[in-house]
Interface confidence: medium
Amino acid sequence: REEEKPFRDCADVYQAGFNKSGIYTIYINNMPEPKKVFCNMDVNGGGWTVIQHREDGSLDFQRGWKEYKMGFGNPSGEYWLGNEFIFAITSQRQYMLRIELMDWEGNRAYSQYDRFHIGNEKQNYRLYLKGHTGTAGKQSSLILHGADFSTKDADNDNCMCKCALMLTGGWWFDACGPSNLNGMFYTAGQNHGKLNGIKWHYFKGPSYSLRSTTMMIRPLDF
């Protein structure tokens, strides 16, 4: 691949002929350093840049604003890419978002959004979404009208309460809202009746904590 055209995302990686899922290095506009990401080349045509993954509870997601800003974890396992990187990537071109979910009974479901981007740090990494489809509920468990990102040390929700403190993790909380994929990881048998778990309300209800989640983005024109 020509040096002047580095990979902006996993779609570029895929289109360059790399169609195996795994870790790749991408060069995001306006970011000083390259970034290692997990590319999912299997789901729905491939080319997906994974921005969040939960699978085993090995990583602590109860972190502050700075850590959610710059990201944490490892793309080979559980991780959060970082809001600054998600903002920078989704500023490059138009993206869609796909969220893959699995419950403790082995049922899989997904939610997909035709448009996804977030604001910058000054805008509290506000969520912008359009066009929800998928099998994880008829309604969107992400706030379609948008919500600011909150963490335990940055309360930007609409609750008159501190959602991120009470539900744990950093997320686009409303009041507090029907989802939190960065909540506490609970193992099988312990995952019912948990308000602060990994929640996608319109898939499994308000207090069921999920087994695994993957959030991934891909350009609209892929």
Partner: antibody, heavy 120, light 111 residues
Framework: QVQLVQSGAEVKKPGSSVKVSCKAS????????ISWVRQAPGQGLEWMGR????????NYAQKFQGRVTITADESTSTAYMELSSLRSEDTAVYYC?????????????WGQGTLVTVSS | NFMLTQPHSVSESPGKTVIIPCTRS????????VQWYQKRPGSAPSIVIY?????PSGVPDRFSGSIDSSSNSASLTISGLKTEDEADYYC?????????FGGGTKLTVLG
């Protein structure tokens, strides 16, 4: 299906206090916010405040701050709204209400209402 | 805090369509979900629209909700009006300072 049953009508003197109860059944009481809303004769709906029983956290509308206290007893799945320093303008039907989606600030389920009359 | 403004009353004949607007005074109407409640005399309010346009089960599809960012307002549309639709209708939204209701609109079904 959540059901909310409120205590009966009250007649109170100006300056006194009233405490209205709201017993919930058929849902997870502790994890759902219980709001209190009132409607004075000929007036619209007015939100007074709410409590999240599992957290014991109550929030109040600015208008009622200092005069209203909302509490909850998880053991009996009952929420309470106490309004003090009553005046004639507080004559209203008082409703408790909750959402099927915990904490969200909209109201799917309502109690039958409690008429509070403030009169000397 | 913001205010939600509704017309005091609207009236229409059975079978017709009526639109009840609800205008937000400050902040974007799209920044928080809007709900609509029906309130009949002597009864508790009941939700007819939530999350801008979602209809709870049991509410007829004659009821629909929408948001218009250009006028910073939400609307409740009731088509195929029936006499039993006669009631007060309230819009409601919220922000980090609490819950706000509109002043209510009295819907009269003529005839």
């Amino acid at each position: 299906q959540v059901q909310l049953v409120q205590s009966g009508a009250e007649v109170k003197k100006p300056g006194s206090s009233v405490k209205v109860s709201c017993k919930a059944s058929g849902g997870t009481f502790s994890s759902h916010a219980i709001s209190w809303v009132r409607q004075a004769p000929g007036q619209g709906l007015e939100w007074m405040g709410r409590i999240i029983p599992i957290l014991g956290i109550a929030n109040y509308a600015q208008k009622f701050q200092g005069r209203v206290t909302i509490t909850a007893d998880e053991s009996t799945s009952t929420a309470y709204m106490e309004l003090s320093s009553l005046r004639s303008e507080d004559t209203a039907v008082y409703y408790c209400a909750t959402s099927r989606l915990e904490w969200l600030l909209y109201l799917d389920y309502w109690g039958q209402g409690t008429l509070v009359t403030v009169s000397s | 805090n913001f205010m939600l403004t509704q017309p005091h009353s609207v009236s229409e004949s059975p079978g017709k369509t009526v639109i009840i607007p609800c205008t937000r005074s400050s902040g974007s109407i799209a920044s928080n979900y809007v709900q609509w409640y029906q309130k009949r005399p002597g009864s508790a309010p009941s939700i007819v629209i939530y999350e801008d346009k979602q209809r709870p089960s049991g509410v007829p599809d004659r009821f629909s909700g929408s948001i218009d960012s250009s006028s910073n307002s939400a609307s409740l549309t009731i088509s195929g009006l029936k006499t039993e639709d006669e009631a007060d209708y309230y819009c409601q939204s919220y922000n980090s300072r609490g819950v706000m209701f509109g002043g209510g609109t009295k819907l009269t079904v003529l005839g």
